[in-house]
């Protein structure tokens, strides 16, 4: 091919090209031919008749003005035709009459102001069609029911201003899982006019500047259709009222999404009328207040987010917002709640009391007060089956003895990113049976003792990152009890010194986050009573992390055993030579990293093992002695692995013998290497 | 086989209303796939299109500029036939009324009635 | 398409062919549909949608249309096709517009 199309597997890849006419040497069996971002002005028919195979058609961001009807002709199996972004303004009934089987049509952001006629009357197999970004004025299609199989119609951002039943009603056969309405300035729902649609499933207006009126003139012309889901984000409600959303009495209304509405009261009974109502997204608004009958009606909500829902605080301490004690009573169905982003002070003794269903509950940067976590704070879950919980960004500072004894069905606990500092007894965890996951990581001060985690024992995750930990070196261990732990994060916390039983007995431990330490003594040979190998006995451990940690050594046998290590990265330490066979038992080794070190020679008797079956290495940045006793079998190796190793050619360079400094290791020769061998051995005798 | 028949006084007065009706067999008034119209030709002269109307939620009809303020055209779905109403008649609209049967979905006639001679006389 | 103008008459020999224009400002983009008329009667359809026959047209009738111009062909003309021949198309909401007719005469 002359054109620098890429092909591959029948799909012919020629956006960006800056073409002006379409390439006609492309082979012949392509099925999809991608033509967007060129400066194609037409598309001759004729051109296409050697690709008619093609099943889809992308002429995108193009200057397309006209369309042959016979373009549809040559190309009788295509099914997806995108036109977005070109220049059309006039369809007539014979622009696509040829395209009987096209099951989506994207006409976004040309110039279509008005359909006239019926251009998509032959269009029985149509699934989506998209107008969106024209300047359409009206809804109207056509004169004629049609579109029988449309299930996606698209009209945001045109100058749509009234939805009126004569224009609606051409789709009394079809069943429109989605009608998109958004950005325009909606100001009139004529009488019938959802009726008219065979079935409507779901109605987006966003950004319709639709104000608490017109929203229930919406509702009630809405009545008594499929209509499932309606979308209402981004527009003027500024209060709802029991009235509000009545029409949709007759609905079972399953998902309302009335996010960035600047909606400051919510009234009493406002979704009354909901019972079926599953979903309901209230994010990114100005609620001063919930009270105990905000959410009354709301029987079978599953799903409620309230991120960032209330009013946000200013000087004055009357402004701060107000849950009201049982306002969720009414939502013993619901299952998630998320109330991030708030400026709620605290939780009080009822607040989510009749949340007896939920089961994830996210509370991050919700709270103005809630420095301390005391047993009172989430009394009013004890009856919620809560499995996941989330604290994080709430400057909690202390959690107090049974702070969670009421969640005895918790798996999930994020206490990160808070403030944290405090001695961990062990009570503040009381009642957590069933708790898989604990993550602490980014907190201000943790102090271990021996019973820290001791009425967890269920746990399998523990996240300690960057909390300055202390006692990590107390006996018993404050790990011991952890019998089920899989993932340990005891990264970034400058710890120079912990006992050979630090991790004893965690067996199923397959994830060790250690980086960002300070071990190097004791893996010194030099180290009083010798080396620490605290990593004796982690037979199932997949992933070891110990980078920065100023290691210069690795003793013998610290590694031993560790036969399902998949991975192990040890960058960015001091190492230089290592011992032959440390690496013996990691044959199943798929990643090493051990870039950023002090190595200058890669030995088979010590890289060997590893090397089996590595999917990647990275040894980017070490100063590799070029000698044939320090790098030849490397070379030898890379040359012929299929293991990754990015940016061999500028980050693998000699660093001596001074005339190969700065030389690139893979061009290293060895075949002299080899030759001398014989001599060596001759030279000893 | 879908068969039109017209009935009709053939002669109506000055500024009096002409009214014919087009009785349908063979097809329904109703029907979403064909429409119903009226057409005339004055002796001696073309076609002209009056009207036509069709169903879609509800009955919706179009009317040629010359006539939109003087004509309607209802359905009878009891009867499954149409009718054609025209006021204010002058022996300008002296001529033979079709009605007619437009096939979706680009409105071509695909069956005529036998045609109605009105005559507008004093 | 407010307007479609057609020549008053067309006259062929029998056995040849005959061709009816209808002209009208980028008829090419809309359907044309072709009736013909025999003193006294209704009108037939015999070319729909540019180009399409209906059942029971012979094979002579033949349409096409592009540009400004549509165009009727009588391929071996007969005698029997002597008649007043209309185009017409639609256009919402006007939706019937007539070319104002051509007598054919077979000589």
């Known amino acids: 091919s002359t054109t620098k199309c890429t092909v591959s597997h029948e799909v012919a890849d020629c956006s960006h090209l800056k073409l002006t006419q379409v390439p006609d040497d492309l082979p012949t069996n392509i099925t999809v031919l991608n033509l967007t971002h060129n400066q194609l002005r037409r598309l001759p028919a004729a051109n296409f008749t050697r690709y008619s195979q093609l099943t889809s058609l992308d002429v995108g961001f193009n200057t397309i003005s006209k369309l042959e009807p016979e373009l549809c002709q040559k190309l009788p199996m295509l099914k997806v035709l995108n036109l977005q972004h070109n220049e059309l303004s006039q369809l007539s009934d014979k622009t696509f009459a040829f395209c009987t089987n096209l099951t989506e049509l994207h006409l976004m952001s040309n110039s279509i102001q008005k359909i006239k006629n019926n251009p998509f009357v032959k269009q029985k197999n149509l699934i989506t069609l998209d107008l969106s970004h024209n300047g359409l004025s009206s809804t109207k299609l056509g004169t004629q029911v049609q579109l029988e199989n449309l299930q996606e119609l698209l009209l945001s951002n045109n100058k749509i201003q009234a939805l009126k039943s004569e224009e609606l009603d051409i789709f009394a056969n079809s069943s429109l899982k989605k009608l998109e309405l958004s950005s325009n300035q909606i100001k009139e729902f004529s009488p019938g006019c959802f009726q008219t649609i065979g079935k409507l499933f779901a109605l987006l207006l966003n950004n319709a500047q639709l104000n608490p009126h017109l929203t229930e003139k919406l509702c009630w012309e809405l009545s008594n259709t499929s209509i499932q889901n309606l979308s209402l984000a981004n527009n003027q409600l500024l209060a709802t009222s029991e009235s509000t959303f009545s029409g949709l009495k007759w609905t079972n209304l399953t998902q309302l999404d009335l996010s960035y509405n600047n909606l400051h009261d919510v009234g009493n009974g406002s979704f009354s009328y909901l019972p079926s109502l599953r979903y309901l997204s209230l994010e990114y608004n100005n609620i001063q207040r919930l009270s105990p009958r905000s959410f009354y009606g709301l029987s079978n909500l599953r799903y409620l987010s309230l991120k960032r829902a209330f009013t946000k605080q200013s000087v004055s301490l009357a402004s701060h917002p107000n849950i009201d004690d049982f306002s969720f009573q009414w939502l013993k169905y619901l299952e998630y709640l998320n109330m991030d982003d708030n400026n709620i002070p605290s939780t009080k003794s009822n607040t989510f009391t009749g949340l007896v269903s939920l089961k994830y509950l996210s509370l991050s940067k919700t709270f103005t007060s809630l420095q301390t976590l005391t047993n009172e704070t989430f009394v009013s879950l004890a009856h919620s089956p809560l499995l996941t919980l989330n604290l994080t960004k709430n400057h909690i500072s202390k959690i107090a003895n049974g702070t969670f004894s009421w969640l005895g069905q918790l798996r999930i606990l994020d206490l990160g990113l808070n403030e944290i500092e405090q001695k961990l007894s062990g009570q503040e965890w009381r009642g957590l049976r069933n708790i898989f996951e604990i993550y602490l990581s980014y907190n201000k001060y943790l102090q271990l003792s021996t019973s820290s985690f001791a009425l967890v024992p269920s746990l399998q995750r523990l996240m300690l990152r960057r909390v300055a930990l202390k006692n990590v070196d107390i006996s018993p261990s404050p790990f011991r009890p952890l019998r089920n732990l899989t993932i340990l994060d005891l990264s970034n916390n400058n710890i120079a010194n912990i006992n050979e039983d630090l991790l004893e007995g965690l067996e199923n431990l397959e994830i060790l986050d250690f980086q960002h330490n300070n071990l190097a003594r004791l893996w010194k040979r030099a180290n009083p009573g010798g080396p620490v190998n605290f990593l004796k006995g982690l037979s199932h451990l997949h992933i070891l992390n110990l980078e920065s940690n100023g290691l210069d050594e690795i003793p013998v046998g610290v590694f031993k055993n560790l036969f399902e290590l998949k991975s192990i990265n040890l960058g960015l330490n001091n190492l230089n030579k290592l011992e032959p066979f440390i690496f013996d038992d990691q044959t199943s080794l798929r990643s090493l990293n051990l870039q950023k070190n002090l190595i200058t020679s890669v030995e088979k008797d010590v890289f060997g093992p590893p090397f089996q079956n590595l999917n990647s290495l990275d040894m980017r940045f070490n100063p590799f002695d070029c000698t044939c006793e320090s790098i030849s079998w490397f070379v030898n190796w890379i040359n012929q692995t299929h293991t990754n190793i990015s940016e061999l050619s500028t980050h693998y360079l000699c660093n001596t013998p001074h005339h190969y400094y700065g030389f690139p290791l893979k061009l290293f020769d060895t075949s002299s290497c080899k030759d001398s061998a014989p001599f060596e051995l001759l030279f000893i005798i | 086989q879908v068969q039109l028949q017209q009935s009709g006084p053939g002669l109506v007065k000055p500024s009096q209303t002409l009214s014919l009706t087009c009785a349908i067999s063979?097809?329904?008034?109703?029907?979403?796939?064909?429409?119903w119209g009226w057409i005339r030709q004055s002796p001696g002269r073309g076609l002209e299109w009056l009207g036509i109307?069709?169903?879609?939620?509800?009955?919706?009809?179009n009317y040629a500029v010359s006539v939109k303020s003087r004509i309607t055209i209802n359905p009878d779905t009891s009867k499954n036939q149409f009718s054609l109403q025209l006021n204010s008649v002058t022996p300008e609209d002296t001529a033979v009324y079709y009605c007619?049967?437009?096939?979706?979905?680009?409105?071509?006639?695909?069956?005529w009635g036998q045609g109605t001679l009105v005559t507008v006389s004093s | 398409q407010s307007v479609l103008t057609q020549p008053p008459s067309v006259s062929v020999a029998p056995g040849q062919t005959a061709r009816i224009s209808c002209s009208g400002d980028?008829?090419?983009?809309?359907?044309v549909h072709w009736y013909q008329q025999k003193p006294g009667q209704a009108p037939v359809l015999v070319i729909y949608?540019?180009?399409e026959r209906p059942s029971g047209i012979p094979e002579r009738f033949s349409g096409s249309n592009s540009g400004n111009t549509a165009t009727l062909t009588i391929s071996g003309t007969q005698a029997e096709d002597e008649a007043d021949y209309y185009c017409?198309?639609?256009?919402?909401?006007?939706?019937?517009?007539f070319g104002g007719g051509t007598k054919l005469t077979v000589l």
């Open positions: 980028n008829i090419g983009s809309y359907y």
């Open positions: 017409s198309s639609y256009d919402d909401p006007n939706f019937q517009v």
């Open positions: 063979g097809d329904s008034v109703s029907s979403n796939s064909a429409a």
């Open positions: 949608e540019d180009s």
């Open positions: 007619a049967r437009y096939s979706y979905p680009f409105y071509s006639i695909d069956y």
């Open positions: 109307i069709q169903k879609r939620s509800k009955w919706y009809n």
